[in-house]
Interface confidence: low
């Protein structure tokens, strides 16, 4: 099944993100993507945990995952870099690098978006943009169409409450409120972007939607920069 | 659609207990903690507590601690609220609710008199 | 433990008058926690708007929400009789969550 979802967002305007990547599996969206070098996709490691035996791609360009549109392209995946110290059991370093078969075709519908290496804490109450083709609702409603939702960014205190994710959330993590408008599993290794800078991955665990005291984690790019320009390198 | 259904009205004399059932359907018992709040005649809503069907872990208003003991089986979607040493203090409708009040059950008077 | 203050208690409003109920935190409260119900007699309480501004499902576009800080209010842009009924705010801002008195609104 397919691993996330947007919730209580609305569709989003077709190709405006042109960073926005799905990643599939066997044809069908499996996670959500970023175009972040003209090679490279930056997704999320547990995306690919049961995918073993299957045919990894990822699409750009798209708005619909149905519709012809000019700017679509499906790319074979060359290799899957997942973060060395990324394990299935836990939201950590929940990171995965796909290197396309080719360099993409870049335009105004394919772009890679600037990530951000400034390694600080976004400031709480931002409001940072989250897309993906997850369910839209608790029905498991799927998508045709990119969603977004817009999401203000959660102090790490207030994240690690005992009500909230208990002191799970490092320094290499950060939340984003889930008050009935949330992503989630399905939308994985989506993008968070504040500002025009992608500041965040959607993480893969089996975290509760659309609950106010299960906030959105993301993991935070800047916190793997190193990582990533040795794996881009 | 999500239901929470409890009992009807209870008669306690004091110094006993009482425990109210709140049944959970129409959704997945263990996605959301289920909230407690007591409301007294005439008086403003109180949050008594609430509990994480998950795990069963609880966190009380420090002003219900001793008096309010919450529980949840899971095999029948059911939490419940234990509440003891009764007084006419206590005398008040009950509500549990999940989904961050979202959802609220309908309520259960109880009235403590000998 | 925060102290939310509604004010007036009771309120008489004419047909499509307008109307704004205030609630006032005795400390500051993160708008994300400040949320307010409607309540009528024999029934639960109902949320009614989420997040200081967001309505709930099937809540009349007429009620709109707003404040920051220390001051919240809920505002009807023309009073209806099914809007005669007990309002009350709630933060979760800071442990315990509270909620205030209420006002009761009554058709003139």
């Known amino acids: 099944p397919p691993r996330g979802r947007i919730l209580g967002g609305r569709e989003a305007e077709a190709h405006a993100r042109p960073y926005m990547a799905s990643v599939q599996l066997n044809g069908a969206h499996l996670c959500g993507g970023v175009l972040v070098a003209e090679q490279w996709v930056l997704s999320a490691a547990h995306c690919l945990e049961d995918a073993a035996d299957g045919k990894v791609q990822v699409l750009l360009g798209a708005h619909s995952l149905s519709q012809p549109e000019p700017s679509k392209r499906l790319y074979d995946v060359l290799r899957a870099v997942p973060h060395p110290d990324s394990q299935p059991d836990t939201i950590d370093h929940d990171l995965l690098l796909l290197q396309l078969s080719e360099k993409a075709t870049l335009g105004p519908a394919v772009r890679p978006l600037p990530w951000q290496r400034v390694d600080r804490d976004v400031a709480p109450g931002t409001l940072c943009d989250v897309a993906g083709w997850g369910i839209v609702n608790h029905a498991g409603r799927r998508p045709d169409s990119l969603q977004h939702v817009l999401l203000p960014v959660l102090d790490r205190a207030t994240c690690n409450r005992r009500t909230h994710h208990d002191g799970a959330i490092t320094e290499r993590l950060m939340c984003a409120e889930s008050n009935r408008r949330d992503s989630c599993k399905g939308d994985s290794g989506g993008p968070l972007v504040c500002g025009g800078v992608l500041e965040g991955v959607v993480t893969s665990g089996s975290r509760v939607c659309g609950n106010r005291k299960k906030p959105g984690i993301y993991t935070r790019v800047a916190s793997y920069a190193a990582w990533i320009d040795s794996v881009l390198a | 659609e999500v239901l929470l259904q409890q009992s009807g009205p209870e008669l306690v004399k004091p110094g006993a207990s009482v425990k109210i059932p709140c049944k959970a359907s129409g959704y997945t018992f263990t996605d959301y903690d289920m909230d407690w709040v007591k409301q007294s005649h005439g008086k403003s809503l109180e949050w008594i507590g609430h509990?994480?069907?998950?795990?069963?872990?609880?966190i009380y208003n420090q002003k219900f601690k001793g008096k309010a003991t919450l529980t949840v089986d899971k095999s029948s979607s059911t939490a419940y609220m234990e509440l003891r040493s009764l007084t006419s203090e206590d005398t008040a409708v009950y509500y549990c609710g999940t989904g961050d009040f979202a959802y609220w059950g309908h309520g259960t008077l109880v009235t403590v008199s000998a | 433990q925060i102290v939310l203050t509604q004010s007036p208690a009771i309120m008489s409003v004419s047909p499509g008058e307008k109307v704004t109920l205030t609630c006032s935190a005795s400390?500051?409260?993160?708008?994300?926690?400040l949320y307010w119900y409607q309540k009528k007699p024999g029934s639960s309480p109902k949320l009614w708007i989420y997040s200081t501004s967001n309505l709930a499902s099937g809540v009349p576009a007429r009620f709109s929400g707003s404040g920051s800080g220390t001051s919240y209010s809920l505002t009807i842009s023309s009073m209806e009789a099914e809007d005669a009924a007990s309002y009350f705010c709630h933060q979760w801002s800071s442990y315990p969550p509270t909620f205030g008195a209420g006002t009761k609104l009554e058709l003139k």
């Open positions: 509990i994480n069907p998950n795990n069963g872990g609880t």
């Open positions: 400390s500051s409260v993160s708008s994300s926690y």
